[in-house]
Amino acid sequence: IPVIEPSVPELVVKPGATVTLRCVGNGSVEWDGPPSPHWTLYSDGSSSILSTNNATFQNTGTYRCTEPGDPLGGSAAIHLYVKDPARPWNVLAQEVVVFEDQDALLPCLLTDPVLEAGVSLVRVRGRPLMRHTNYSFSPWHGFTIHRAKFIQSQDYQCSALMGGRKVMSISIRLKVQKVIPGPPALTLVPAELVRIRGEAAQIVCSASSVDVNFDVFLQHNNTKLAIPQQSDFHNNRYQKVLTLNLDQVDFQHAGNYSCVASNVQGKHSTSMFFRVVESAYLNLSSEQNLIQEVTVGEGLNLKVMVEAYPGLQGFNWTYLGPFSDHQPEPKLANATTKDTYRHTFTLSLPRLKPSEAGRYSFLARNPGGWRALTFELTLRYPPEVSVIWTFINGSGTLLCAASGYPQPNVTWLQCSGHTDRCDEAQVLQVWDDPYPEVLSQEPFHKVTVQSLLTVETLEHNQTYECRAHNSVGSGSWAFIPISAGAHTHPPDEFLFTP
């Protein structure tokens, strides 16, 4: 450990005195002390001499000698008082910054230890300390405000009683900063911007933090913009706002805008895109197929995405037929805004009835004009079947009519016994009709097909069944020849009510 001469903890001298402080160690040594004038430093191997031949109150302070090469980091110190009757205080710093709940050292050093009994801490202009200010004093270091609070951010003076009067130090500004949880919070509005060339635009970048010490800037395509800053203090947070006002936008104003804020904790940034267009636009699209097929009785939502600027002046859903002149109920139409320039419009069609098949059109209007998007809705039906016995060109023929959508396939079965429906054990013969005759096939309607089965002789203890099926379901009709004539049976289980 280095040794200081004179070997006393503190030294008291008068202004103008000569002071020599010598430090000796095993290796090279270094002095550290308050920044003050008139000192001369002389080093010679393992010793170092700090001297002045004109001490002033500003030389008051603690001088520490260290040995850099010492692994234990030992040091020695001596405190020097230069007792100036006119200057009881040597202030080492005029601004002290701490965080809340930290101890704040106000470094006013007493120049005469005799004065310690009459020292006090006051606020500038002779104001008393705020209530609950907990502080202590050290003649070597100054006043310490313990666990400083934000409200204690004040200007302080150290006071000493000299000859019955109070002598003040120069003021020390204490700034107690709120504990910062992270970089400033940011907002950049709007999140997206579209303007027609020549229109006005405004972009607002704002940042807030519990502490006033932070920076914020707005940049356009990596170029920092020079914008006047508006400050505010709101909800116990400091806010800084940059507002970019463009009276007449042009294409060079388009691009990426970033709002960037930083403090001791780090940096936050957020971006938006500004698009400048030549004229108004209105685009309609759908993620759905414009040709829709739904089973009767089920529901469907038709969705249209709209991209538009300026905003829509009008929109509606229209039913274009062919079944009736009914229009969609407004309560079934729903609009949601994804963001400023994109919207989704939904038409809900619950429990679809046969008369609701057809074309549905969404129409929208803005200053760019009208646009429409049309859906074609076809309903799917399970087949309905009927069979009659007739003679065609003198031949006995079973005629099966099947109606449904999609177009039904037809299969004939002949089975033993009288039954409403042939089962596998009874089947005697099966005929597939790959190409039944299409009787009617209009858009949005059921498809009706006809299949003929020529039967030379009807077997009386047998059943002839026409079966039709499509992707929705199946239907059948059993024909039972009886002596008095033909008898037909629609199956009991098939009673279709849409």
Partner: antibody
Framework: QVQLQQSGAEVKKPGASVKMSCKAS????????IHWVRQAPGQGLEWMGA????????NYNQKFKGRVTLTTDTSASTAYMELSSLRSEDTAVYYC??????????????WGQGTTVTVSS | DIVLTQSPDSLAVSLGERATINCKAS??????????MNWYQQKPGQPPKLLIY???DLDSGIPDRFSGSGSGTDFTLTISSLQAEDVATYYC?????????FGGGTTLEIK
Amino acid sequence: QVQLQQSGAEVKKPGASVKMSCKASGYTFTSYWIHWVRQAPGQGLEWMGAIYPGNRDTNYNQKFKGRVTLTTDTSASTAYMELSSLRSEDTAVYYCTGAFAGYYDWYFDVWGQGTTVTVSS
Amino acid sequence: DIVLTQSPDSLAVSLGERATINCKASQGVDYAGDSYMNWYQQKPGQPPKLLIYVASDLDSGIPDRFSGSGSGTDFTLTISSLQAEDVATYYCQQSYEDPRTFGGGTTLEIK
């Protein structure tokens, strides 16, 4: 001691602007915020804004934003408040004030004597 | 903005009696245990004068018959023994956030 000396009374027509001054003495002008508060005849007090002469930071009451401009001349230790587009309801006594006790000013303990502004056609 | 509502609008109290003025804030004005609420006295033709800061600290040179209390949203200015020179209008003011706002004022007179 700390003092704030304000300029004399003004009479203005609607639509005009008025610029008043507040000369500070007894302290370091650049170290403390100066606030402006007005009081219409028979009415309460209304904070308008503040300026920090050290770096010319400003805080404005949004109610007056665009109509109020706060400036300082540090060489003359003087703060200025300009109010534009005057209307009859701007008739009031305008005070400059401050705390002069720290960077953050929680209260106003020094006030100017006030400048009376009358707006009349 | 924080709205401060003072009550009553006017108050008549006999000399030597206690006077109490209330101030209610539209939101809390406390931070870290301190209330950012101040009280001022204004006499006709004069600027306001600070009486109480941070809810209860008495300003230098203010007689100790004046006191302040309260926290959060409810604050009170009390004059323990009314003197003739206390006839004035009293305002509360918050410095919790900008814009700084004042109460509407309470006019105190002698009964």
